[in-house]
């Protein structure tokens, strides 16, 4: 007996061919001998089966001796043996219908688990193999689970169900809800405007939720909430903002925050959380601010940085177009009795300059000028 696999919700076509290449009488029945459909002359007739409104044939093939049974919007319970009676002979086709669904929602937060459940007809023993968008293969029986979803798991999962040496393929689109970056760092000179951006790694029609930015300044003993906001259909509205600093927030996505001035007392780390409507858990993005200040007090030229810097970062003071006078893996460097000229304070990582501040040292009878 021929075996045909179908997918829940899909359409399947079961073939029945007569030796005579012309339109003759045929009937399709199920295993209980209940008539599904057939013909009477050139008319399509339907029986009392539960498939009545979902069964059809392809009349255009009748003249060629082909009498297919089309079943639309397949259900698991349509799995059965179907019998085509034509020319005093019977052709049997076993139809097995499978369904594959994601546990709850196909939009999952980063770090959550994905469970795929296979619906299969009684008596079947299928095996399932799924391939994630990043090429990871998982195998299982009735359920497959993937814990700790990552951003790279977003996309189309291709799952193959194998039964009786035949296969049927399912494609499930999974969206992992996360920020594009888990962490970011902004380097600014004192007094400069600071832009923080929190782009999302997904797009959805409607996005509603609420968020907050907590900030732990390096100089402060505890963290504090800098801003809270609401998100409604991708429109951002500020609920509450601290007086110091007075952050500004963009009204549209991506989430965008502006700090009017980078000051040493603001240097530190922040955690932006976003709680999405109808989702348990929150999205997180860490943001860091490093602030640099170069000053000259009497005979001392000082360069300082505040904020979360890695121990391998190098802080240097150098006279323009000259070798560095001082370079240290520390957060402050200074030069006593600096020569007159344009001095540069550089924060660098393996030779790559991350932040630079210039200060003009005038001959000793003048006062210093900061450009």
């Amino acid at each position: 007996k021929k075996v045909v696999l179908g997918k829940k919700g899909d359409t399947v076509e079961l073939t029945c061919t007569a030796s005579q290449k012309k339109s003759i009488q045929f009937h399709w029945k199920n295993s209980n001998q209940i008539k599904i459909l057939g013909n009477q002359g050139s008319f399509l007739t339907k029986g009392p089966s539960k498939l009545n409104d979902r069964a059809d044939s392809r009349r255009s093939l009748w003249d060629q001796g082909n009498f297919p049974l089309i079943i639309k919007n397949l259900k698991i319970e349509d799995s059965d043996t179907y019998i085509c009676e034509v020319e005093d002979q019977k052709e049997e086709v076993q139809l097995l219908v499978f369904g594959l669904t994601a546990n709850s929602d196909t939009h999952l937060l980063q770090g959550q688990s994905l469970t795929l459940t296979l619906e299969s007809p009684p008596g079947s023993s299928p095996s399932v193999q799924c391939r994630s968008p990043r090429g990871k293969n998982i195998q299982g029986g009735k359920t497959l689970s993937v814990s700790q979803l990552e951003l790279q798991d977003s996309g189309t999962w291709t799952c193959t169900v194998l039964q009786n040496q035949k296969k049927v393929e399912f494609k499930i689109d999974i969206v992992v809800l996360a920020f594009q970056k888990a962490s970011s760092i902004v380097y600014k000179k004192e007094g400069e405007q600071v832009e923080f951006s929190f782009p999302l790694a997904f797009t959805v029609e409607k996005l509603t939720g609420s968020g907050e930015l907590w900030w732990q300044a390096e100089r402060a003993s505890s963290s504090k909430s800098w801003i809270t906001f609401d998100l409604k259909n991708k429109e951002v509205s500020v609920k509450r903002v601290t007086q110091d600093p007075k952050l500004q927030m963009g009204k549209k996505l991506p989430l965008h925050l502006t700090l009017p001035q980078a000051l040493p007392q603001y240097a530190g780390s922040g955690n932006l959380t976003l709680a999405l409507e109808a989702k348990t858990g929150k999205l997180h993005q860490e943001v860091n601010l490093v602030v640099m200040r170069a000053t000259q007090l009497q005979k001392n030229l000082t360069c300082e940085v505040w904020g979360p810097t890695s121990p391998k970062l190098m802080l240097s003071l150098k006279l323009e177009n000259k070798e560095a006078k001082v370079s240290k893996r520390e957060k402050a460097v200074w030069v006593l009795n600096p020569e007159a000229g344009m001095w540069q304070c550089l924060l660098s990582d393996s030779g790559q300059v991350l932040l630079e501040s210039n200060i003009k040292v005038l001959p000793t009878w003048s006062t210093p000028v900061q450009p």
Partner: antibody, heavy 120, light 106 residues
């Protein structure tokens, strides 16, 4: 999005064969019939035959029986139509088209067409 | 095979006109009739299936009617992009198409 992409134009000599491919994407390949329709220059549309990609079953219009062969490769979601014993009147644009979900034997998505020129 | 005859073979009309194309089957085909639009150098596009059902994405100015042997395609108010060739096709028996109706700008 759902699309059918066909192979490029061919020039053949009378008596030769031509094999045109039609690659499906954006839907479950095995669910819907693929049909072949041709159109001679300046003429109307002529239905050639069908394939059920799920079972591999095929059928063709009486005019083409014995000359047309349809095959499929489910691993690449591709259907092939081979026409043999070519004659000059087979010069045409050959289209593949798929059935819609709603009704059999209407053609809701078409390939871009493959021009086959038969000339000595 | 069932013969499908379209009339007229060609017609000229202006933007904004109401246009009707007819298709006659050589025997009764119930409502197993589809209509297509084809522009030069392009593949045909399904407009209407089952005689009167508008295909998804097709503008509502297109409509189809008829059953048995006589069918019509109506464009209520011609738009510049509607100038093309129109084909009817039956699927009651082995698929056959009408010879086409060329709709030109007057």
């Amino acid at each position: 999005q759902v699309q059918l992409v066909q192979s490029g134009a061919e020039v053949k000599k009378p008596g030769a064969s031509v094999k045109v491919s039609c690659k499906a994407s954006g839907y479950t390949f095995t669910t819907y019939y693929i049909h072949w329709v041709r159109q001679a220059p300046g003429q109307g549309l002529e239905w050639m035959g069908w394939m059920n990609p799920n079972t591999g079953d095929t059928g063709s219009a009486q005019k083409f029986q014995g000359r047309v062969t349809m095959t499929r490769d489910t691993s690449t979601s591709t259907v092939y139509m081979e026409l043999s014993s070519l004659r000059s009147e087979d010069t045409a644009v050959y289209y593949c088209a798929k059935d819609p979900a709603v009704t059999p034997d209407a053609f809701d998505i078409w390939g871009q067409g493959t021009m086959v020129t038969v000339s000595s | 095979d069932i013969q499908m005859t379209q009339s007229p073979s060609s017609l000229s009309a202006s933007v904004g006109d109401r246009v009707t194309i007819t298709c006659r089957a050589s025997q009764s085909i119930s409502t197993y009739l589809n209509w297509y639009q084809q522009k030069p150098g392009k593949a045909p596009k399904l407009l209407i299936y089952a005689a009167s059902t508008l295909q998804s994405g097709v503008p509502s100015r297109f409509s189809g009617s008829g059953s048995g042997t006589d069918f019509t395609l109506t464009i209520s108010s011609l738009q510049p992009e509607d100038f093309a060739t129109y084909y009817c096709q039956q699927s009651y028996r082995t698929v056959t198409f009408g010879q086409g109706t060329r709709l030109e700008i007057k």
